[in-house]
Amino acid sequence: SCNTATCVTHRLAGLLSRSGGVVKDNFVPTNVGSEAF
C-alpha cells in the first residue's frame, strides 16, 4: 500500500467523501499516518 504523503491525502479525501465528512476535526493528512487506513 502506498504510504507517501500524497497517497495519504487522497485516501483521506476518499474516506471523508464516503463518510459524508463525519469524522473528528483533527482527521487531516498532516495529523494521520498511513496506519490510520
Epitope: T6, C7, T9, V28, T30
Partner: antibody, heavy 119, light 107 residues
Framework: EVQLLQSGPELMKPGTSVKISCKAS????????MNWVKQSHGKSLEWIGD????????TYNQKFKGKATLTIDKSSSTAYMELRSLTSEDSAVYYC????????????WGQGTTLAVSS | DIVMTQSQKFMSTSVGDRVSVTCKAS??????VAWYQQKPGQSPKALLY???YRYSGVPDRFTGSGSGTDFTLTISNVKSGDLAEYFC?????????FGGGTKLEIK
Amino acid sequence: EVQLLQSGPELMKPGTSVKISCKASGYTFTDYYMNWVKQSHGKSLEWIGDVNPNNGDTTYNQKFKGKATLTIDKSSSTAYMELRSLTSEDSAVYYCASITIVPLYFDFWGQGTTLAVSS
Amino acid sequence: DIVMTQSQKFMSTSVGDRVSVTCKASQNVGINVAWYQQKPGQSPKALLYSASYRYSGVPDRFTGSGSGTDFTLTISNVKSGDLAEYFCQQYNTYPYTFGGGTKLEIK
C-alpha cells in the same frame, strides 16, 4: 479562495544562498503537506521534497539533500525553501504546491519564483 | 528512482479531434499517477489524480486510464485552449517523479 503566493524573482551570485517563500491563504495551512518542485528552463519538473506544516517534518529527494532546506512558519502560514551553495545549475523556476481537501479538493500551485544564478 | 517516460515529446492534433498522451512507469506504481497541464508562461495545473479521477472544475473532456506501468491521458473534442504541455507524475514512491512532458500542438 485558496492561494499560494510566492516571493519574487531572485538574481544571485554563485556560492551564495537564497530563501524563497510561499504564503498560503484560504485554507488551514497546517492540515496539508507542502511540496516544492523545480523546473529548469524548457525542461520537465523535479520534485524537491515536502514538509508537514503541522510539525515541520520533511521528506527530501536525495538529489536535493544538502542543497534545499524546507521550513515553515505556522504563525504566518508561510513555507520556505532555502537553497545553498548556488551554482548556475540551480537557475530555474521553483514552485510550491499543496493538495487540499477543504474547502476544495484540489492540487494548488504557486505562481513560481524565478531564480537566476550568475556572476 | 522510478522513471516516468513520455515517449512522444510533441503531438499534433486539430480542434475537435481526440488525442491520447501516454506515460510509462519503470516499475509498478498502482494507480498513483497524476496528470498536469502547463500552458506557456503559467504554473502547472492539476487535471487528474489516481490515474483517472478529475479534480473539481476539470472538464470531462479530460479522461485518464491505466494502472501498474502504463497510463493514458485522453483529451476529447480538443479546443484551441488545450495548447499546452502535459506531464504525468507518480506519487507511489519517494521521490515523486515526473514524465518529460508532451507538447500538444494545434493544427
